[in-house]
């Protein structure tokens, strides 16, 4: 399943509109305005969120009131109502959206399909690498771990070296360097399987340095809404890619009858984008700093940014709610098709399987949900927290709470159904996947709202660790490692493969719950947050001898 | 399905090992679980023990610890079970059959007549 | 302790008419929902043949006329209506603990 850099890193990109208009402000003498980043601030949002010049935040699920509740409405001053109403104030222009900018976003939107479709091919394919290496479920959680773990600490470092170095490049041996990787994994004697692990671990540095350079290429070659919307359909190839991957790895192994070949789709395919790439890919200049940010990090440093994060409540426990969301989805993604082929072989609609292509079936029907589901849940979320806003002021967070504590309620009921029937664990699936995917585009919007613009992008790094580190980056082994300590205390049988591992994967729920907790948590802190954060803002925008942080 | 093919008739003299194989073919699709059952009028059926063909466990019923061995060889999906010093006791009919579903036996091979006497 | 099997020696029903073959366990054999209790047919000099699994469910092939009930210790094989090709011994398993363990069997014969 998809890790939730979606929509995080969709804040990120949103953060720069959000400077820009706040540049273009000061350059016209505006004054600040009631409870926001400026008068007219427009705030950055996550998933498919459109920016607005206007005081209302146009996010994804609707548009929100800048002015929290817990605050008296200060009156706009008449410079401010002059910049909004005034030929002064700056006017939304249509999208000229360049073919060849356009050809570059779409090329790095297939660079991420390609990206996650490799990622997830391993797990679609599952069943053949047990078979073919003769690993117990802890080795196989193994692969999807350690390529988390090598992904989550190449990425700052390649955040790093794309800030100072050209970043097409980095971009194309990025994925030069994983395809020859993955396309080398598949040659791997069954002797060998340390190798195949070392070879993940290599595929997630060369897939980190994509993950992280490729959004500030196109939050560099477009502005205001269509940088948002470009990213948001960047961000949209997650879903995507991790369902072809399970399709792509079992509909290949089916038609080549042999599972090393759905390890050698997407390594071609990445050599094809890559070139692309280099050919198509416009040498981007990097974003100046604007001079609200220039302002606040000649008075900050990363140490002070990160005390004020973790002071934060609501950021902290939002962060905790996405690892786990994080958590569950990555063992989920990799375990679930695993854990319906052995149901299918306990109610004898399959057989175990001894010789490859295994549970192909199943990878494939499990792909075509991820993909879907990945879609209907932001779109879901959205939909319920622009219906709840018109209640609470508190929507966000509690709409990501009922969608945890639902989707948990679905995934205890996998287990149930998959005992008696398959079809109702797949609505069991369709359904808690939905839920639990619905907050993918909320938790950016929280972020945006109780961190001020010049700290969001550590935020959003420091959330994007944090939920791998605690989340996806020990879960899928976790799960294994459990469901062999069950049979090793138990029995092995076709039986006790199938139930060890669905005792394991019922950690997934009371994680989800947990999340659903730290969820309800944001909730209670989410409106003095928001105030807070909204008048450092308005602090920030006055002279610079009266700036606090 | 999956036919087990077992190998046929043995003789043996008491103090001796016999090994008898057990061959699976028909459909790809078979079962990881060999088990191996040993039938005699007196005592009806016995189960003595598996072995996992994909990662080569294997699992004895206390009463067989020492006196029978499984292996298998995963090229040919063949299974063997080894009876090391044989008495008079162990003379019965020796059947593979494979382990599936909720820990049933799906398929089982035709039966291997073991005799030990003098 | 493992778990023992105690099944009725004989039965002789009519042609055509219900035979009950019953199997008690010396424990309960139902874990995590399923009821792990199993009936094999064994002709003479043949392999037994797997006829109900999970204690109510017929394996592929076997005809209707086979059924299976009971949870927890009592378990019930019915054949209805019995035919002369159903001669044969009936054997019960577990499979909830460790080693697996079989009746004694039960032999059917025509009255």
């Known amino acids: 399943m998809m890790c939730l850099e979606c929509a995080s890193a969709a804040a990120g990109g949103a953060e720069e509109e959000e400077a820009d208009a706040e540049r273009r402000r000061r350059r016209r003498g505006a004054q600040p305005g009631a409870g926001g980043s400026a008068c007219c601030g427009a705030r950055g949002v996550g998933g498919a969120g459109v920016v607005s010049a206007d005081e209302e935040v146009q996010t994804l699920s609707g548009s929100v009131r800048r002015v929290p509740s817990g605050l008296p409405s200060i009156p706009s001053t008449p410079g401010c109502a002059a910049a909004a109403k005034g030929p002064s104030a700056p006017q939304p222009k249509p999208a000229s959206l360049g073919r060849g900018r356009g050809a570059a976003a779409a090329i790095l939107s297939l660079g991420n399909v390609l990206n996650y479709l490799d990622r997830y091919t391993v797990a679609g394919v599952l069943l053949d690498i047990q078979q073919h290496f003769g690993v117990k479920d802890r080795g196989a959680g193994l692969l999807q771990s350690v390529f988390i773990c090598s992904f989550m600490v190449a990425a700052p470092i390649f955040g790093y070296l794309g800030d100072r170095f050209n970043r097409k490049v980095i971009l194309s041996c990025g994925i030069f360097f994983w395809s020859a990787v993955t396309f080398s994994s598949s040659f791997i004697p069954q002797q060998y399987f340390w190798l195949l692990v070392l070879s993940r671990g290599l595929v997630g540095i060369g897939e980190a340095s994509y993950s992280t350079i490729a959004p500030t290429i196109i939050g560099d070659l477009f502005t205001k809404n269509t940088r948002t919307l470009m990213l948001s359909v960047f961000y949209f190839a997650i879903p995507l890619g991790s369902g072809l991957g399970y399709i792509t790895g079992s509909s290949v192994k089916q038609a080549a009858g042999d599972w090393h070949w759905a390890l050698r789709v997407s390594p071609v395919l990445g050599m094809i984008t890559g070139t692309l790439i280099l050919i198509l890919v416009p040498a981007t200049k990097r974003g100046h700093a604007d001079q609200l940010g220039g302002q606040l990090k000649a008075r900050t440093s990363w140490l002070r940014d990160m005390k004020a994060l973790i002071r934060n409540r609501s950021y902290v426990f939002s962060s905790l709610a996405t690892s786990a969301v994080s958590f569950a989805t990555g063992a989920l993604g990799m375990w679930i098709p695993l854990y319906l082929h052995r149901a299918q072989v306990v109610q004898k609609t399959a057989e175990t399987c001894n010789s490859p292509p295994c549970g192909a079936k199943d990878s494939l029907i499990f792909g075509a949900i991820t993909c879907f589901t990945g879609f209907l849940g932001v779109v879901t979320g959205a939909g319920a927290t622009r219906w709840c806003r018109l209640r609470t002021q508190r929507a966000d967070p509690l709409v990501c709470a009922v969608g945890m504590l639902g989707s948990a309620i679905f995934i205890c009921l996998i287990f149930v159904a998959a005992k008696t029937s398959i079809v109702g664990a797949y609505i069991c699936i369709f359904v808690g996947e939905t839920l639990l995917f619905s907050n993918w585009a909320i938790t950016a919007d929280i972020l945006m709202y109780v961190v001020i613009p010049t700290r969001r992008a550590t935020a959003v790094a420091l959330q994007s660790f944090t939920s791998h580190l605690l989340g996806d980056a020990g879960s899928p082994y976790l799960i294994g490692f459990i469901s062999d300590l069950i049979r090793q205390s138990t029995k092995d049988s076709p039986l006790w493969e199938f139930l060890s591992l669905g005792y394991a994967l019922m950690l997934c729920p009371f994680v989800v719950v947990l999340g659903g907790m730290f969820f309800l948590a944001t909730a209670l802190f989410f409106l003095s947050d928001r105030a807070k954060a909204e008048q450092q803002v308005n602090q920030l925008v006055m002279p610079p001898a009266s700036v606090k942080v | 399905q999956v036919q087990l093919q077992q190998s046929g008739v043995e003789l043996a003299k008491p103090g001796s090992s016999v090994k008898i194989s057990c061959k699976a073919s028909g459909n790809t699709f078979t079962s990881n679980y060999i088990t191996w059952i040993k039938q005699t009028p007196g005592q009806g059926l016995e189960y003595i023990g598996y072995?996992?063909?994909?990662?080569?466990?294997?699992y004895y019923n206390e009463k067989f610890k020492g006196k029978a061995t499984l292996t298998a060889d995963k090229s040919s999906s063949t299974a063997f079970m080894q009876l090391s010093s044989l008495t008079p006791d162990d003379s019965a009919v020796y059947f593979c059959?494979?382990?599936?579903?909720?820990?049933?036996?799906?398929?089982w091979g035709q039966g291997v007549m073991v005799t030990v006497s003098s | 302790d493992d778990i023992v099997l105690t099944q009725s020696p004989a039965l002789a029903p009519s042609l055509g008419q219900r035979a009950t073959i019953s199997c008690r366990a010396s424990q309960s054999v139902r874990m995590s929902g399923y009821n792990l209790m199993h009936w094999y047919q064994q002709k003479p000099g043949q392999q037994p043949k797997l006829l109900i699994y999970?204690?109510?469910k017929l394996a592929s092939g076997i005809p209707a006329r086979f059924s299976g009930s009971g949870s927890g210790t009592d378990f019930t094989l019915t054949i209805d209506p019995v035919q002369s090709d159903d001669i044969a011994t009936y054997y019960c398993?577990?499979?909830?603990?460790?080693?697996?363990?079989f009746g004694a069997g039960t032999k059917l014969e025509l009255r």
């Open positions: 398993q577990q499979s909830k603990d460790d080693p697996y363990t």
């Open positions: 999970d204690a109510s």
């Open positions: 059959a494979s382990l599936t579903g909720v820990d049933y036996f799906d398929d």
């Open positions: 072995i996992n063909t994909g990662s080569g466990k294997t």
